[in-house]
């Protein structure tokens, strides 16, 4: 019996088609992805093959103005339109708190939303009961397939799930649910979830009875053969893990941003064992037409976005200096504003011993593309912020050793004076450079804001200590020559859309007046 699994993950609000790098579509003839194009391909496969499931492994929320404006209603609407069969909760589904998940998505979705390792307690338990499930048994042809969900247990550090949701260890939580499915005579089981490729592989290895793992969170691109675009495969598709009980378990993920549709064909025997598995992600490029009815719906929903772009978010009473003449040479107040917003967006008081789990921010000056003049009545709009941060990136959470941070700050000024983009703006860091010294030895003082303290203060950076840092995904991926970050990071979790982070901060503050205050000397 053959099952076709179509899957997406980490779509991050890319409802409209995008450019090849998943930023805003400029030249339509070269654009990719989007729900209208996805629907065309899904329908084509549904017509051609008998047993098809369309699954999403989480993080539909967060990433473009679509989410900023519609707050998840767009996810429910278009996933319903595409007739998704199931979705796992990702960490970003909690970005607007539990209410921001329940109202727009959980109550509106016509498909099951899953996570076995999230347990509700207190008053939330009855409110959320039945709105998401640990597993769902789906009829497919004359067979049944069990889908069990899981979500990164790091979610409390990455989003805003509140205090009434407990995120358990994935493997510990999944095993009893899979065992329950087995007692219900469900012998074909897919683990669908959002904890990253390493955890996906562990689930395949450790959870007895899981036949296939469909994952997300780490934006992993797998491919067998010659890849069709710029993404470099992390392994073959599917990636085969040998389970502790001796089975071969296929593990898949489909990169991110709706650029690909994962396509996996599984052959099951009478006992529900995987006899064979093969496939590849399908690049959703312009050779696949956009479905006209979904496209028309997108255009209808688009109108509200254009109106939103010009509405006032808040005010500035100072000039926001985002000029390259400032931000690539010295501390600039636009850099300070953005870093302050990045830290503010990551306030998570999850431990009494820590005032926050992260205190530091770094930001390449070259990523700040425009100033904002306060003489327009101080008004700041989304449109203004889009000029400052035009690349559609995210502000991510990484863990780095102190020695890596030291290298990063040396790189920041290794060719100082040439107006290059690697000059770092900071938050929660005091750095002193001596530019008379030779490159690679110019950082003379590097103090960082403590986290395990009730009164935050600056202490010297320790080379062997592991620090959490918020930074643009561009830097996490080694951009602007920061190869040491990419090579030496110990953990990387993707965060919220850059413009959204700053716009939320400005809306919260209402009036801003960031200063140049001696963070960089």
């Amino acid at each position: 019996w053959e099952l076709t699994i179509l899957h997406t993950n980490d779509v991050h609000s890319r409802l409209e088609q995008t450019s090849e790098d998943s930023s805003k579509c400029v030249n339509a003839s070269r654009c990719m992805g989007g729900v209208a194009r996805l629907f065309t391909k899904v329908q084509q496969i549904r017509r051609a093959e008998p047993n098809v499931l369309l699954l999403d492994a989480g993080d539909q929320y967060q990433g473009t103005i679509w989410f900023t404006v519609y707050k998840g209603a767009e996810v429910a609407h278009f996933m319903n339109a595409l007739r998704y069969d199931a979705m796992a909760l990702g960490n970003h589904e909690f970005d607007n708190g539990v209410e921001g998940l329940i109202e727009p998505l959980l109550k509106e979705a016509k498909f099951p939303i899953l996570s076995a390792n999230i347990k509700a307690k207190g008053p939330l338990a009855s409110q959320i009961s039945g709105l998401y499930l640990p597993y769902k048994v789906l009829p497919v042809g004359d067979e049944v397939v069990g889908i069990v969900g899981y979500t990164s247990k790091e979610t409390p550090f990455l989003s805003n799930p509140g205090t009434n949701l407990v995120f358990e260890d994935e493997i510990t939580a999944l095993q009893p649910e899979v065992d329950k499915l087995k007692t219900l005579n469900v012998n074909k089981i897919i683990a669908l979830g959002h904890s990253g490729f390493e955890m996906d592989k562990l689930i395949a290895q450790k959870v007895r009875g899981v036949d296939v793992v469909v994952g997300g969170h780490s934006n992993t691109f797998l491919y067998t053969g010659n890849p069709p675009s710029k993404e470099v495969p992390a392994g073959k598709y599917p990636f085969i893990v040998t389970s502790d009980d001796g089975r071969k378990v296929p593990v898949v993920q489909a990169y991110a941003f709706g650029k690909y549709l994962g396509y996996l064909k599984i052959e099951f025997d009478e006992r529900g064992n995987v006899i064979s598995s093969h496939g590849n992600p399908i690049l959703l490029n312009s050779s696949i037409p956009e479905d006209p009815s979904i496209k028309a719906d997108i255009n209808k929903w688009r109108i509200k976005l254009d109106n939103y772009s010009t509405q006032e978010l808040g005010k500035t009473i100072v000039y926001l200096d985002g000029s390259s003449q400032s931000c690539r040479f010295r501390e600039c107040n636009m850099g300070n504003l953005i870093c302050d917003a990045m830290i503010n967006n990551n306030l998570r008081h999850t431990d009494e011993m820590f005032w926050n789990h992260v205190s530091m921010c770094i930001l390449n000056g070259g990523g700040i593309r425009s100033p904002i003049d306060e003489r327009n009545n101080g008004t700041i709009t989304w449109e203004n912020l889009a000029a400052v941060l035009p690349f559609g990136g995210t502000f991510d959470l990484v863990q780095l050793k102190g020695s890596t941070l030291k290298k990063a700050f040396e790189h920041s000024v290794h060719r100082y004076g040439q107006s290059t983009g690697e000059f770092l703006q900071v938050g929660g860091i005091h750095v002193v450079y001596d530019l008379s010294r030779k490159p690679g030895d110019r950082v003379v003082k590097l103090d960082v804001l403590c986290t395990k303290c009730r009164v935050p203060s600056y202490d010297p950076l320790k080379m062997d200590e592991v620090y959490k840092v918020i930074l643009p995904n561009f830097l996490a991926n080694g951009g602007d020559g920061f190869q040491m970050i990419k090579d030496e990071l110990l953990r990387h979790d993707s965060g919220d859309q850059d413009i959204n982070v700053v716009s939320t901060y400005i809306s919260k503050m209402k009036v801003i007046y960031p200063a140049v205050e001696g963070r960089i000397k």
Partner: antibody
């Protein structure tokens, strides 16, 4: 639980027709095929034929003229019919799942007058 | 038809021994190979499917490997209950079996 069970006569006279039934539980014949295999005493396993989930059948070329496999999906039963039986057809006859994950216990059919 | 050549046809071994049985296909069967165990009473049980995946409840001393046309069943430490006849079965085309390997007590 996934199980298969063969049933039918233990003794068949030469030239007669053998009819064996394989009763399936734990899976659907609309999703999976059933294979038939036999093993003469002290000899090797020999594939006879298969009926696929869609209802079509394939046969070992050596038996194509006298073998028919059919099914009744609603009863979860597959029927093997072999005409013109001969003493050399004495064997244990097994039905098995399409992928060999499950086997019947086998039924010994003796062809003798 | 795809022919399967299995060797050895029989072997004598002691409890605790490592036993290896091989099967060669007349053409590439792309990992579509099972290993079966038949006990003296005639009952047939699949041990390994798709070349190397272990069936539920089968001890981990059994392992399968191979690709293309060459396939191997290994019993890492023979136990008293393992004395039986073992067959390879290819299902890339119409089923064909290897000639069997009878594992006897030395």
């Amino acid at each position: 639980e996934v199980t298969l069970k063969e049933s039918g006569p233990v003794l068949v006279k030469p030239t007669e027709t053998l009819t064996l039934t394989c009763t399936v539980s734990g899976f659907s014949l609309s999703s999976y095929g059933i294979q038939w295999v036999r093993q003469p005493p002290g000899k090797l396993l020999e594939w006879l034929g298969v009926i696929w989930s869609g209802g079509s059948a394939d046969y070992n070329a050596a038996f194509i003229s006298r073998l028919t496999i059919s099914k009744d999906t609603s009863k979860s039963q597959v029927v093997l019919t072999m005409t013109n039986m001969d003493p050399v057809d004495t064997a244990t006859y097994y039905c098995a799942g399409q992928y060999g994950s499950v086997w019947g216990q086998g039924t010994l059919v003796t062809v003798s007058s | 038809d795809i022919q399967m050549t299995q060797s050895p046809s029989s072997l004598s071994a002691s409890v605790g021994d490592r036993v290896t049985i091989t099967c060669r296909a007349s053409q590439d069967i792309g990992d579509r190979l099972n290993w079966l165990q038949q006990k003296p009473g005639g009952a047939i049980k699949r041990l390994i499917y798709a070349t190397s995946s272990l069936d539920s409840g089968v001890p981990k001393r059994f392992s399968g490997s191979g690709s293309g046309t060459e396939y191997t069943l290994t019993i890492s430490s023979l136990q008293p209950e393992d004395f039986a006849t073992y067959y390879c079965l290819q299902y890339a085309g119409s089923w064909t079996f290897g000639g069997g390997t009878k594992v006897e007590i030395k």
